[in-house]
């Protein structure tokens, strides 16, 4: 088992990258002198206890920043949040910490990230630029749920 996070960069099909702004992840067009975040990701060590054929369950964090992506309900609405958390603390837990887990599915060069805690809800960005990352149930409409993930070795 790989027990150290892998690093990667993410952009969407409109070549927007993820940037951290006031503890919020937003998707913006890539520009000079911009610092896109580097993603840290690690597969859940308890993969056998999760749903099969839905994708690879992973924890998603921001490399070097002790911040991880999580899903939580605000009212009745699942929302995407950044929480201060060491990704390895999540990885080592005795059970999957589902609020921090995403099923990572790849089709060709495209990746999707589906919430394990809220099946059917995906990480997305609005088709308009400069918007925060969100969770959506509506695929391929006003929001983009397909991302390009490039691993950094």
């Amino acid at each position: 088992k790989i027990d150290t996070p892998q690093r990667g960069s993410i952009q969407d099909i409109n070549h927007r990258v993820w940037v951290l702004q006031d503890q919020t992840l937003i998707a913006v067009p890539r520009k000079d002198r911009m610092s896109p975040v580097t993603i840290a990701l690690i597969s859940c060590r308890h993969v056998e206890t999760l749903e099969k054929d839905r994708g690879n369950p992973i924890y998603l964090g921001l490399n070097g920043l002790n911040l991880c992506l999580m899903c939580a309900k605000v009212g009745d609405q699942p929302t995407l949040q950044l929480k201060e958390k060491d990704i390895m603390d999540l990885y080592n837990q005795p059970e999957p910490v589902k609020s921090f887990l995403f099923y990572h599915s790849q089709s060709g060069r495209n990746s999707t990230f589906e919430s394990v805690a809220f099946p059917g809800w995906f990480i997305a960005v609005s088709s308009e630029g400069g918007c925060p990352l969100i969770l959506t149930q509506e695929l391929g409409k006003a929001n983009t749920t397909d991302f390009g993930l490039t691993m950094l070795f």
Epitope: T49, L50, N92, P94, P96, V97, S99
Partner: antibody, heavy 121, light 109 residues
Amino acid sequence: QVQLVQSGAEVKKPGASVKVSCKASGFNIKDTYIHWVRQAPGQGLEWIGRIDPAIGTTRYDPKFQGRATITTDTSTSTVYLEFSSLRSEDTAVYYCARLHYFGNNFFFDYWGQGTLVTVSS
Amino acid sequence: QAVVTQEPSLTVSPGGTVTLTCRSSSGAVTTSNYANWVQEKPGQLFAGLIGGTNDRAPGVPARFSGSLLGGKAALTLSGAQPEDEADYFCALWFSNHWVFGGGTKLTVL
């Protein structure tokens, strides 16, 4: 408030099976893991296994693999433990417990009241 | 499979401090064992006290603290109250299953 309410006491003959229920209220069982633990008279606690009610996946102590079966009915927020091929040494109080992630760790925070299973010929 | 051992009984004076321990037959207890401590008061339900070695469960008084001590998980009660008289059980995680201890009967006398 969070509650786990278990079914009543059972008396079984050796070789028989028993099915104990644990009904959850005050929380969504899909957000937690439900464990089964037993305590024989005068003994400590013994972990049997657990279920993820959202998915239905289970883990068991190797000692009980094959004899214990944990299932769930999410429509009624109920978790079941079925124990087969009962022997006299399976006489114990059987408890369900919630393992819940809070803050940074998992806690066995809430427990059922226990179900006494007596195995006697 | 590991055997988890606790002191069968301990006594503490009201206001005093006592440490309960939890030993594993498979070697030193570490943070990777995610030690949990649960309390059973006479006539009451079990209740979680500590998770992840040293995290207090919500609502648990600060007089209860968890730690690692000499290769064992430890539960320290500082300023014992009469209502702390109970049975205390530890649970340790081993890769894919939990093992509980035999319990410690704590008397506040």
